[in-house]
C-alpha cells in the first residue's frame, strides 16, 4: 500500500490564530479530527471540500478543522488571537517567488514579463485554448494568474491580453534570488523551506522522517517556523532537515546580501574583546548584563517589545543576542530575558584603554582576580584585612591571603554565586558584586542533580510525635501581612528569620509589613493565646535571579508549642523523585466560602526533564530549581500562598525543599509546580544567619 | 503592548468596568496600574495590583473603584461612577512585580459621566 | 503617606536655556522617584528612574537628581520638542498614598 504523503509542510503556521470571515458569502467546511496533519492532508487534496482549500485551521480545544477557500491575505477575511487555534496557510498561496519551474506556483501575479496584463484562464479571448480551469483540476487556473500547470522550462506563464501575442512568461523570481543572509545566516529568519538539491524540509516541530532535538518550544529564539532553512548551530550557513528519510539534513541555497546598508563615513572602531569610548563598534559575543541576566535576542519583541530590531538598525550588527550599543548609549547593553528587567549594561565587558584586570568569573568565582571594588547595590567594598575576623568566623580554613588584595571582589569562602565583599555598612555587612560568569563558561555549581548523591536530611533523628501530625507541626508557618491583610507565606528558620519570596514586598516601606507566627486561622481567630505578631527590621535579598528574601523579624520569635523553626537541607541535595512533599497555605482555595484555615496539597517530587515534558518543553528546569506534581488534580500553590513551603520529609526529618513564587500559573491540572530549590541556596541562607546581626531576645 | 477599552458616556450610577489588555508580555512577571486624567488637570493614580494577586488603592479611591485580573487582562470596575470620574483612564505597566515606576501606558480611554 | 509636591506649576524657558523642576516628598523615599514627559493627546513618557537613570532612548540633556525628599529635573539646551507637562511619581510605597504623582510642571518653550 502506498504510504500517503504528509503534507503539512506545504503550510505555513500562525500559532494562537484563526480567520474570522467579515464576508457572510464565504464558504467554510468543518470536521472533528485527531490532528493538525490530518487537516492538512484534506486540504491538499481537496478531498471532499466543495472549494480549492487555501488555509485551515485546527482547533486543539475540539480537536477540529476549519477548512477554508481563502487565507490571511483574502479580502472579507480578518486575523483573530485564540489560544486554541492553529492556522495553516498553504505557502503555495502566499508565497511570491517560484521554486524550480514553478509548477506549484499559485500566486496573484497576472501580469507578464514584458508587462502585458493576462487572459482569464476561461476566457477565450482575445486567443482561443484548451487550458481550461475543469481540464487542470488542482492546477488553480484562477482568473487571470500566471501559472505553469505542465511544469514548462521558463516558468509561470499566460495568454496575454493582447491580441498580437498569444502568450507569454512572467517575471516571478525563484525563491533562492529573493531569499538572503546576511554572514553565516544564524540571523536568517526568512521562508525558504527547500534544499540546494530541492528535497522539502522537514518541519521543526515534526520528528519524522528525522528525530531531532532542535524543538521550537525548546528554542524559542532560534526562530524554528514550520519547515525554513535556520542555521541554529553555528554551521557555515542555514540548512534543514529533509523529508527524504534517507538524508537526514541538507544545506539551503540562500545567497548573502548586497550589503550596502553600510555607510563609509563615521564607522566606530570594532573592537571584539573590550570596549573602545562608549562601545558603538563593540562586535564581541557577551550576551549577558552585568549581573549575568542573559540578554534577550534582538530579533525577538519577548519579554520586551522595542523597536531596535535588525531590520532598523542594519550596519549595527545586533545578531543574536550579543551585547551592543546601536543608540549612543553610555557602554553596550541589552534588553534582558528577565521580564522584571527591560535593559541592562555589559558593564562587565573590559575597556580597551584601561586594564581592568578580568571583568567576569569562571565557575564560582573563587579565582576571580578583577578589580572591582562595588557591592550589585552600589557600595563601595571596605578592605578585607579589616575584616578577616569575621572571614574567619564563617570559614573554617585559612583563606588565600594574597588574592585578599585591597578591598576588590573576591570569593575567598567558595561562595556558590560568585564573587562578594566586606561593605563596612553594619546593615548589610557583605553582599554579591555586579560581575557575571565569563562568556561560554557552563560548569555547573552543584554536579549531578539529578542523582541523589547527598542526603537532603542532616540527621536521622525522628520528628514527628508518635507518628500523629498535629497543630504543632506546622509552628514553622508564618502569615505575612502588608497592610493589616494576609498577603504571602513563609517559613521560620531562624528565631529572627522567615525565608519568603521577593514579591511579596510590594513596599519598600517596611512598616508595611508585620508576621504573624503560630496561627492556624489567617485572621487569627482562636489562636490569641499562641499568636506572635512580629514587625519586620530587614530585607535581605538573594543571590541575583534567585527570587528569595530572607525577612529579618525586629525581635527573635519565641519558640514553644506553637512556633517552631524548619530545618533547611544539606547544600546541593537531591531528593529522590516520588518523595511525598507538601506545600502550605492560606492562599486562593477556589471556595467561596473559604474558611481562612492553614490548607495544605500533597506534591511528590519529580525530575527537572520529566517535569520539562509535562510542560511541553516550554519550561527548561535549571538547577536553581525543583519540581513538584500534584497527587491530587488541580491542588497545589496559588494567589496568597507565594513565600510559602514545599516541606518534603527524608529520614522522618521535615525540610523546607522549595519556596512557592509567582509566574508559574495556578495549581493548574497535569502541570507539575516549579518551586525555588532551597537546596541550592542553602549556603547563601547560612551564611546571611551567620553574618547578619539579630537582635537578642 | 497595553491597550484600555470600555471607556464611554455613562449617566451618573451606571457600574462601568474598563479593561486593559496586554500582549507581548506576561501578568505573572510585572504589576500593573490605573492612572487617570481629568480634563485639563495632572495625573492622578487609583490603583495597582501586584504579581502576587495583591492590590492598593490611592486613599480617595478605596470603596469607589475594584481593580481585579485574568491571565491577560486588568480590569477597573467603577460601580458608581459620579460626574468627578469623568477623565481619559490610563492602564499602565509597573516595571516590577513590586512598586516602582510605569515603563509601558496604554493611549488611554476616555471615561464621560453626564446626566 | 508619601505625596508629592511639584514646582512651580508653570515655567517659560527660551530655546537653548536650562529648566529646572523641583519634587518634594512628604517623607524620604531615598532614590525611588521618576520623572515623566507628556504631551497634549498622549500618554505620559518615562524619562527618568530611580531619581536619576535615564530611561532608554532619551536624550542626555534631561537629567535627574535628588534623594531622600528633595529631588530636581534639569533640563539643559532646551529645544521645542520638550515643550510639554513634567510630572514626578514616587515608586516608594502606596501606603495611604492621595496621589503617586506631583502636580505637574507646564514647561513652555519661547
Known amino acids: 500500500q502506498r504510504k500517503r504523503r504528509n503534507t503539512i509542510h506545504e503550510f505555513k503556521k500562525s500559532a494562537k490564530t484563526t480567520l474570522i470571515k467579515i464576508d457572510p458569502a464565504l464558504k467554510i467546511k468543518t470536521k472533528k479530527v485527531n490532528t493538525a496533519d490530518q487537516c492538512a492532508n484534506r486540504c491538499t487534496r481537496n478531498k471532499g471540500l466543495p472549494f480549492t482549500c487555501k488555509a485551515f485551521v485546527f482547533d486543539k480545544a475540539r480537536k477540529q478543522c476549519l477548512w477554508f477557500p481563502f487565507n490571511s491575505m483574502s479580502s472579507g477575511v480578518k486575523k483573530e488571537f485564540g489560544h486554541e487555534f492553529d492556522l495553516y496557510e498553504n505557502k503555495d498561496y502566499i508565497r511570491n517567488c517560484i521554486i524550480g519551474k514553478g509548477r506549484s506556483y499559485k500566486g496573484t501575479v497576472s501580469i507578464t514579463k514584458s508587462g502585458i496584463k493576462c487572459q482569464p484562464w476561461s476566457s477565450m479571448i482575445p486567443h482561443e485554448h484548451s487550458f481550461l480551469p475543469s481540464s487542470y483540476r488542482g492546477k488553480d487556473l484562477q482568473e487571470n494568474y500566471c501559472r505553469n500547470p505542465r511544469g514548462e522550462e521558463g516558468g509561470p506563464w499566460c495568454f496575454t491580453s493582447n491580441p498580437e501575442v498569444r502568450y507569454e512568461v512572467c517575471d516571478i523570481p525563484q525563491c533562492s534570488e529573493v531569499e538572503c543572509m546576511t554572514c553565516n545566516g544564524e540571523s536568517y529568519r526568512g521562508l525558504m523551506d527547500h534544499t540546494e538539491s530541492g528535497k522539502i524540509c522537514q518541519r521543526w516541530d515534526h520528528q519524522t522522517p528525522h528525530r531531532h532535538k532542535f524543538l521550537p518550544e525548546r528554542y524559542p529564539d532560534k526562530g524554528f517556523d514550520d519547515n525554513y532553512c535556520r542555521n541554529p548551530d553555528g554551521q557555515p550557513r542555514p540548512w534543514c532537515y529533509t523529508l527524504d528519510p534517507h538524508t537526514r539534513w541538507e544545506y539551503c541555497a540562500i545567497k548573502t546580501c548586497a550589503d550596502n546598508t553600510m555607510n563609509d563615513t563615521d564607522v566606530p572602531l570594532e573592537t571584539t574583546e573590550c570596549i573602545q569610548g562608549q562601545g558603538e563598534g563593540y562586535r564581541g559575543t557577551v550576551n549577558t548584563i552585568w549581573n549575568g541576566i542573559p540578554c534577550q535576542r534582538w530579533d525577538s519583541q519577548y519579554p520586551h517589545e522595542h523597536d531596535m530590531t535588525p531590520e532598523n538598525f542594519k550596519c549595527k550588527d545586533l545578531r543574536e543576542n550579543y551585547c551592543r550599543n546601536p543608540d549612543g548609549s553610555e557602554s553596550p547593553w541589552c534588553f534582558t530575558t528577565d521580564p522584571n528587567i527591560r535593559v541592562g549594561y555589559c558593564s562587565q565587558i573590559p575597556n580597551c584603554d584601561m586594564s581592568h584586570g578580568q571583568d567576569c568569573y569562571r565557575g564560582n568565582g573563587k579565582n576571580y582576580m578583577g578589580n572591582l571594588s562595588q557591592t550589585r547595590s552600589g557600595l563601595t567594598c571596605s578592605m578585607w584585612d579589616k575584616n578577616m575576623e569575621d572571614l574567619h568566623r564563617h570559614i573554617f580554613w585559612e583563606p588565600d591571603a594574597s588574592k585578599l588584595n585591597e578591598n576588590y571582589c573576591r570569593n575567598p569562602d567558595d561562595d556558590a554565586h560568585g564573587p562578594w565583599c566586606y561593605t563596612g555598612n553594619p546593615l548589610i555587612p557583605w553582599d554579591y558584586c555586579p560581575i557575571s560568569r565569563c562568556e561560554g563558561d557552563t560548569t555547573p555549581t552543584i554536579v549531578n542533580l539529578d542523582h541523589p548523591v547527598i542526603s537532603c536530611a542532616k540527621t536521622k533523628q525522628l520528628r514527628v510525635v508518635n507518628g500523629i501530625p498535629t497543630r504543632t507541626n506546622i509552628g514553622w508557618m508564618v502569615s505575612l501581612r502588608y497592610r493589616n491583610k494576609h498577603i504571602c507565606g513563609g517559613s521560620l528558620i531562624k528565631e529572627s528569620w522567615v525565608l519568603t519570596a521577593r514579591q511579596c514586598f510590594p513596599s519598600r516601606d517596611l512598616k508595611d509589613y508585620e508576621a504573624w507566627l503560630g496561627i492556624h486561622d489567617v485572621h487569627g481567630r482562636g489562636d490569641e493565646k499562641c499568636k506572635q505578631v512580629l514587625n519586620v527590621s530587614q530585607l535581605v535579598y538573594g543571590p541575583e535571579g534567585s527570587d528569595l528574601v530572607l525577612m529579618k523579624l525586629a525581635r527573635p520569635a519565641v519558640l514553644d508549642d506553637f512556633v517552631s523553626t524548619i530545618d533547611l537541607p544539606n547544600y546541593g541535595c537531591t531528593i529522590p523523585e516520588k518523595t511525598s512533599c507538601s506545600v502550605y497555605g492560606w492562599g486562593y482555595t477556589g471556595l467561596i466560602n473559604y474558611d481562612g484555615l492553614l490548607r495544605v496539597a500533597h506534591l511528590y517530587i519529580m525530575g527537572n526533564e520529566k517535569c520539562s515534558q509535562h510542560h511541553r518543553g516550554k519550561v527548561t528546569l535549571n538547577e536553581s530549581e525543583i519540581c513538584a506534581g500534584a497527587e491530587k488534580i488541580g491542588s497545589g500553590p496559588c494567589e496568597g500562598d507565594y513565600g510559602g513551603p514545599l516541606v518534603c520529609e527524608q529520614h522522618k526529618m521535615r525540610m523546607v525543599l522549595g519556596v512557592i513564587v509567582p509566574g508559574r500559573g495556578c495549581a493548574i491540572p497535569n502541570r507539575p509546580g516549579i518551586f525555588v530549590r532551597v537546596a541550592y541556596y542553602a549556603k547563601w541562607i547560612h551564611k546571611i544567619i551567620l553574618t547578619y546581626k539579630v537582635p537578642q531576645s | 503592548s497595553v491597550e484600555e477599552s470600555g471607556g464611554r458616556l455613562v449617566t451618573p450610577g451606571t457600574p462601568l468596568t474598563l479593561t486593559c489588555t496586554v500582549s507581548g508580555f506576561s501578568l505573572s512577571a510585572y504589576a500593573m496600574s490605573w492612572v487617570r486624567q481629568a480634563p485639563e488637570k495632572g495625573l492622578e493614580w487609583i490603583a495597582v495590583i501586584y504579581v502576587i494577586g495583591a492590590t492598593d488603592y490611592a486613599s480617595w479611591a478605596k470603596g469607589r473603584f475594584t481593580i481585579s485580573r485574568t491571565s491577560t487582562t486588568v480590569d477597573l470596575r467603577i460601580p458608581s461612577p459620579t460626574t468627578e470620574d469623568t477623565a481619559t483612564y490610563f492602564c499602565?505597566?509597573?516595571?516590577?512585580?513590586?512598586?516602582?515606576?510605569?515603563?509601558?501606558w496604554g493611549p488611554g480611554t476616555l471615561v464621560t459621566v453626564s446626566s | 503617606a508619601y505625596d508629592m509636591t511639584q514646582t512651580p506649576a508653570s515655567v517659560e524657558v527660551a530655546v537653548g536655556g536650562t529648566v529646572t523642576i523641583k519634587c518634594q516628598a512628604s517623607?524620604?523615599?531615598?532614590?525611588?522617584l521618576a520623572w515623566y514627559q507628556q504631551k497634549p493627546g498622549q500618554p505620559p513618557k518615562l524619562l527618568i528612574y530611580q531619581a536619576s537613570k535615564l530611561a532608554s532612548g532619551v536624550p542626555s540633556r534631561f537629567k535627574g537628581s535628588g534623594s531622600g525628599t528633595e529631588f530636581t529635573l534639569t533640563i539643559s539646551g532646551v529645544e521645542c520638542a520638550d515643550a510639554a507637562t513634567y510630572y514626578c511619581?514616587?515608586?516608594?510605597?502606596?501606603?495611604?498614598?492621595?496621589?503617586?504623582f506631583g502636580g505637574g510642571t507646564e514647561v513652555v518653550v519661547k
Open positions: 517623607q524620604s523615599i531615598s532614590s525611588w
Open positions: 499602565a505597566r509597573v516595571y516590577d512585580s513590586v512598586w516602582n515606576h510605569f515603563n509601558l
Open positions: 511619581q514616587q515608586a516608594y510605597s502606596v501606603s495611604n498614598v492621595d496621589n503617586a
